[in-house]
Each structure stands twice: as C-alpha cells, then as structure tokens.
C-alpha cells in the first residue's frame, strides 16, 4: 500500500531551487558546447521532471528515465572515456585540463544532476524539499540512485577503444564491487567495442611508493575484465598533484622522464 501522506525519509530533501538549477545548468551547458546548441532545455527539464514527479520515490525504475536518456544522447570519441570511483574531484580536475577526455559529469545529463538530490511524492505534482529516500536506510530504487545507475550504464555501454578509470588508492577497497563503477559500469563495457580498460590508481600519501596495482581488489578487477575479453592495464599515479601539473604542462622538464 502506497502512503498518501507526506513521507518522512531518512535522507536530505530535494536541493533548493532544483528546477531552476537544472534549467540554468542546461542552458550553460549548451552555451559552452556548440554541438549542443540546438537543445531545448525546457524539453530536457520536462523529461527529467516526468521521471520522478507524482511517483512513489522508492519505486523508481530505469524505465522512468528512458525519455530523458533518449533526449540526452551524446557520444564520446573512442579512447576518451574516463570512469572514476571514489575520486570524483581529481577526475574532474583532470578532464578540465585534458579537455578531450570526458567523465559522465562532463556530459549533459551528468552535468545537470551532479551533486544534486531530488524526489517527488506519490500522486502529487510537488517536489519534496523536506526529505528524500536514503539508499541504505530507506530504499535503493530512489530517484537519484536510479538516475545514476541508468546514465552510468548508458555511459559505459557507449564507450569504445581504451577506457580509463581513476581509482582511489587511499581506500581500503581500491576497487569496490559495490560502487557504481564496480556494479554497473564494469559490467556494461562492450567487449566488441572496448579493447582495454586502463586503471589509474591514485596514491594518497606523498611517501607511498607501494605498487597498488598488485592490490587484491585490483587483481579482482583484472579478473572480471579479462573474463569479459577486455584487456586490462594498471598504472600507479604516485603524485596526483604532479600528475595534474604534467597534464597542464607536458613540456615541463620534470615531466619528460618516463
């Protein structure tokens, strides 16, 4: 039985001014990306809204987001997809410098929803600004989680060539099977289109010289990928600050050695 009263969920409510934020982000995105100059952001918002408004927020399906996903079709050139897990900020800093590589949040739909929370209420046209379902405490089929699962699946499915993934070497599980990368993206890379997955393991400590590519969880990732007939490579990024600096200035003498 679906409740008729306003549900009190365990998670924080919809981000303040959510419709205005999505619309403004969409307009900004189309202004910065000339290839998207034709996009009617009102239509994008209508499709976004249609995915969760008036629906019970613990019963959202990937199907609900299909109209939006259909509208937001974008392709990334082969060899230019960057996935990430538990290290979003560095991944985004990297694509801001290396402008020809793209994370999901560099694409229209990911850009629209990044860091936002939203949910509606069953049988009303209202957005719930008080509370939204928490993935652990309430339900996993909530509007935000299902959105990211849907767009992450699509992003992985369309990747081709050599796909890169940035992983956080400071975590106890460098590769986590329960992360979006581990549970969705890894399993939706298409072996007929993806030749290889290259993992970049980002080290946290300055003096950390271990080969984290030998970590048991990385070996687990290698096993999963190899079984899917995709080659696997792994690189240690010992100094993320230096790494970014060298992406910015590849001619710097300290960047030229191996």
């Amino acid at each position: 039985v679906l409740p008729r009263w306003r549900q009190q969920w365990s998670g924080s409510g919809t981000t303040s001014r959510f419709p205005e934020t999505v619309l403004a982000r969409c307009v900004k995105y189309t202004e910065v990306h000339p290839e998207m100059r034709h996009v009617d952001c009102q239509s994008v918002w209508d499709a976004f809204k249609g995915a969760f408004i008036s629906k019970y927020p613990c019963n959202i399906t990937e199907e609900d987001y299909q109209p939006l996903v259909k509208l937001g079709t974008q392709t990334v050139p082969c060899n230019k997809t960057l996935l990430w897990s538990r290290i979003k900020d560095l991944a985004h800093q990297f694509t801001q410098v290396q402008r020809d590589m793209f994370t999901l949040e560099d694409m229209l739909l990911g850009y629209l929803a990044d860091d936002l929370t939203w949910c509606g209420e069953f049988n009303t046209f209202e957005i719930n600004y008080q509370s939204c379902p928490d993935w652990r405490k309430d339900c996993s089929n909530n509007p935000v989680s299902v959105f990211w699962k849907t767009v992450s699946r699509r992003f992985a499915e369309t990747a081709c060539g050599v796909v890169h993934v940035m992983l956080n070497g400071s975590r106890s599980k460098i590769f986590d099977k329960n992360s979006t990368f581990g549970s969705v993206e890894v399993h939706n890379l298409q072996p007929e289109k993806v030749q290889a997955l290259e993992a970049w393991v980002i080290h946290g400590g300055r003096e950390d010289s271990r080969d984290l590519c030998q970590d048991p969880t990385i070996k687990e990732l290698e096993s999963i990928i190899s079984k899917r007939n995709i080659r696997f490579f792994c690189k240690n990024i010992y100094r993320p600050d230096k790494f970014l600096q060298c992406v910015k200035n590849p001619e710097d003498s300290s960047c030229l050695s191996g």
Epitope: P34, E35, R37, H38, S43, K70, G72, T73
Partner: antibody, heavy 118, light 110 residues
Framework: QVQLVESGGGLVKPGGSLRLSCAAS????????MSWIRQAPGKGLEWVAS????????YYADSVRGRFTISRDNAKNSLYLQMNSLRAEDTAVYYC???????????WGQGTLVTVSS | QAGLTQPPSASGTSGQRVTISCSGS????????VYWYQHLPGTAPKLLIY???QRPSGVPDRFSGSKSGNSASLAISGLRSEDEADYYC???????????FGSGTKVTVL
Amino acid sequence: QVQLVESGGGLVKPGGSLRLSCAASGFTFSDDYMSWIRQAPGKGLEWVASVSNGRPTTYYADSVRGRFTISRDNAKNSLYLQMNSLRAEDTAVYYCAREAWSGEFTDWGQGTLVTVSS
Amino acid sequence: QAGLTQPPSASGTSGQRVTISCSGSSSNIGINFVYWYQHLPGTAPKLLIYKNNQRPSGVPDRFSGSKSGNSASLAISGLRSEDEADYYCAAWDDSLSGYVFGSGTKVTVL
C-alpha cells in the same frame, strides 16, 4: 549588413563535379557555423551540409555524404561546397546560410542553380 | 532522410487565423529547438521563428510559434495577402546529426 553571395552553379553531366562558393560579408565569418541548403524544382528545402567555427567539424545529409565536401576559408570569408559524382537528383538551387548560436539560419544568400543533366 | 511532417496546404480569408502543424520525433522536435521559415518563390528563405517561439526583430507579432512534445505549430493571425508563401519548419535531428526540414505548407489567402 550581412551579405551572402553564392557562385559556381551551372550545368553539369551526371558523374561530373562542381564547386560552389559563398562570399560572406557584414559579420565576423570565423565566429559562425555555416551551411548549405538546397531546393530541388517543385520540392521543399533540404539541408545539405554544415561546418562549425573554430577547428572545423563537418556534418552532412545522408543523401550527399561521401560525395560532397563542405569547407571554409576564414581568411577569405568564404564557404565552399565541392560536389562530386553528381546525380540528376542533385539538381536544385543551392543556398548558403549563416547559422546563429541556437541553430537557426538567420541569413541566406539568393542561391545558385545547379543542373545535372546529360 | 525522414523529414518533419507538415500539411501540404492551408488557407484562410484576409484577417483570419491560420495554424500550420509540424510533427517530428523525440530525436528532433522532442529534444531540440524548432525553427520556422517563410519562402516566397524566387527569393531567399526568411527566418520567422527561432527557439520554438521567438521572433527575430522585424517579424510581425501576427506570427507565433509553439511546441509541445514531438510537435510544433506556427500560427498566423490577421492573415494578409503578403503572407501567401511556403512555410517550413525545421529542427536538428540528434540521430542523423543534421537538420531536418518539414515538407512545406503552401499558405493561400482567399
């Protein structure tokens, strides 16, 4: 004011080639996307090709892809359409058009007639 | 290349209101802006409406555009003899990576 003047049209045999030019003035040519649109006799408008500003990206209608090449020379304020392997169905008035930021064709030339016939 | 669907003709007496429909799909009108052009024989086409419902300066407010879902329409109110022309809708199509035009609607003032 904005002016777009097409030239290079004429009569050509099937399988032949032709190069259309469009001379642009009255705006910063290098800033804008440019397109070719055609109208066959008694038919409607049909988009043919577009070229972006900056490092040019090109887009083509399925009906001309592989046969036509759109290009631009920003130094000369000129847009071109190289048409190879011409067919009778390519007979049309070809218009050069300037694209505004949100995709609309704000300015059009008067058109140049291309006739493909043996 | 599948275009947008328009009625071949529309007519009305002077002063009347005429509406032209334009139907497409989720990959063109559904996601992207709709544009309307007026074309008089022997002249260059003229932009009437951009971004679904915006009029360029110089276009009379008798012309108005709207969009809903995968369809759009152009309304001409207070029809005048100089409005006799062919009218085309257009939109970018994401699946084709190109523009699609409607087949055109000939407007006649009776």
